[in-house]
């Protein structure tokens, strides 16, 4: 399954929108900084097959979409930017979904890398718990916004590797 070029463009658009969503200076939130343990090894496109990489990408985007679809998120961000950002993520999910469905239909498809899926899920658990502990404060959301920009950048790199594999 070949991810369309528009998928990468969508990812870049999502990153731009996320950058625009920043409301407060990151420097005023330095005390709230947190290491969420982004599982960078899961974004090494050389370590597993394309099908597995697409499943990991899908999980990453789906968890990001869910995170920014909560009521707490709606209260934290400018509505029109949040809606545009969610729309970009949704489009990416559709592209990735079509790819995964295509691969699921092929009997020779290897088992999915369940530990990679779990690593992504645990990463977002840490983010969720951080927001809960910080009571969804503006600075907590700013820290999370910066972190998601970082994770989306990693997923953009993974997509580049995947396209080279085509």
């Amino acid at each position: 399954c070949d991810l369309p070029q528009t998928h990468s463009l969508g990812n870049r658009r999502a990153l731009i929108l996320l950058a625009q969503m920043g409301r407060i200076s990151p420097f005023s939130c330095l005390k709230d900084r947190h290491d969420f343990g982004l599982p960078q090894e899961e974004f090494d496109g050389n370590q597993f097959q394309k099908t597995q990489a697409i499943s990991v990408l899908h999980e990453m985007i789906q968890q990001t979409f869910n995170l920014f679809s909560t009521e707490d998120s709606s209260a934290a961000w400018e509505q029109s930017l949040l809606e545009k950002f969610s729309t970009e993520l949704y489009q990416q999910l559709n592209n990735l979904e079509a790819c995964v469905i295509q691969e699921v239909g092929m009997e020779e498809t290897p088992l999915m890398n369940e530990d990679s899926i779990l690593a992504v899920r645990k990463y977002f658990q840490r983010i969720t718990l951080y927001l809960t502990e910080k009571k969804y404060s503006p600075c907590a959301w700013e820290v999370v916004r910066a972190e998601i920009m970082r994770s989306l950048s990693f997923s953009t790199n993974l997509q580049k590797i995947l396209r080279r594999k085509d």
């Epitope: 499943s55 899908h58 999980e59 789906q62 968890q63 979409f65 869910n66 679809s69 999910l93 990735l96 979904e97 995964v100 469905i101 699921v104 999915m112 369940e114 530990d115 779990l118 899920r121 645990k122 977002f124 658990q125 840490r126 969720t128 718990l129 809960t132």
Partner: antibody
Framework: QVQLVQSGAEVKKPGASVKVSCKAS????????MHWVRQAPGQGLEWMGE????????IYAQKFQGRVTMTRDTSTSTVYMELSSLRSEDTAVYYC????????????WGQGTLVTVSS | EIVLTQSPATLSLSPGERATLSCSAG???????LYWYQQKPGQAPRLLIY???NLASGIPARFSGSGSGTDFTLTISSLEPEDFAVYYC?????????FGQGTKLEIK
């Protein structure tokens, strides 16, 4: 509000298969993995596996690999769990439970479906 | 597979008393992925505590959780009649996800 409604009780003979359904409502069906957990009479809870309704990928517990098949129908927001080669030890209440994160992990359960395997 | 062992298997106490339920993991479990559920006869399990010590929505403050590594505890500070049920600890730190065998809390 989130609701998971399961199909009714089943009685099956050893060696047969059973297919239990779980219809979801009150949230975007494709956004959350759905899990299956079973409970034999008077026993504890046992995780069987999960399915991502968005694309249909599954992760099964090794114990059930080869005997369990989880599928979904996005048009009806329903997930299915089929267990084959049934034996008496498979007599249990089967639950679907929605995944999520933080306080949403297994916060929503179906009412359970009793499957009885008896000759 | 991470085996969760709960103790005691049965705990007999009276309303108003303090209940302490233990969950011991066969290997270390990150506290973020350790949960507690309550189950009453004929009902589905109900989420009580997530990530070791956080109270789920609608759960009374008399319930609390603690622990780390391989030892986790659920405490009910003063038992109410509706608290008598079976309690399960659960981990999703690694596949396959597992549950403890349960602790039955019964009226003395």
């Amino acid at each position: 509000q989130v609701q998971l409604v399961q199909s009714g009780a089943e009685v099956k003979k050893p060696g047969a298969s059973v297919k239990v359904s779980c219809k979801a409502s009150g949230y975007t069906f494709t956004n959350y993995w759905m899990h299956w957990v079973r409970q034999a009479p008077g026993q504890g809870l046992e995780w069987m596996g999960e399915i991502n309704p968005s694309h249909g990928r599954t992760i099964y517990a090794q114990k059930f690999q080869g005997r369990v098949t989880m599928t979904r129908d996005t048009s009806t927001s329903t997930v299915y769990m089929e267990l084959s080669s049934l034996r008496s030890e498979d007599t249990a209440v089967y639950y679907c439970a929605r995944g999520g994160l933080g306080p949403a992990w297994f916060a929503y359960w179906g009412q359970g479906t009793l499957v009885t395997v008896s000759s | 597979e991470i085996v969760l062992t709960q103790s005691p298997a049965t705990l007999s106490l009276s309303p108003g008393e303090r209940a302490t339920l233990s969950c011991s993991a066969g290997s270390s479990v990150d506290s973020s992925y350790l949960y507690w559920y309550q189950q009453k006869p004929g009902q589905a399990p109900r989420l009580l505590i997530y990530s070791t010590s956080n109270l789920a929505s609608g759960i009374p403050a008399r319930f609390s959780g603690s622990g780390s590594g391989t030892d986790f505890t659920l405490t009910i500070s003063s038992l109410e009649p509706e608290d008598f049920a079976v309690y399960y600890c659960h981990q999703w730190s690694s596949y396959p996800f597992t549950f403890g065998q349960g602790t039955k809390l019964e009226i003395k």
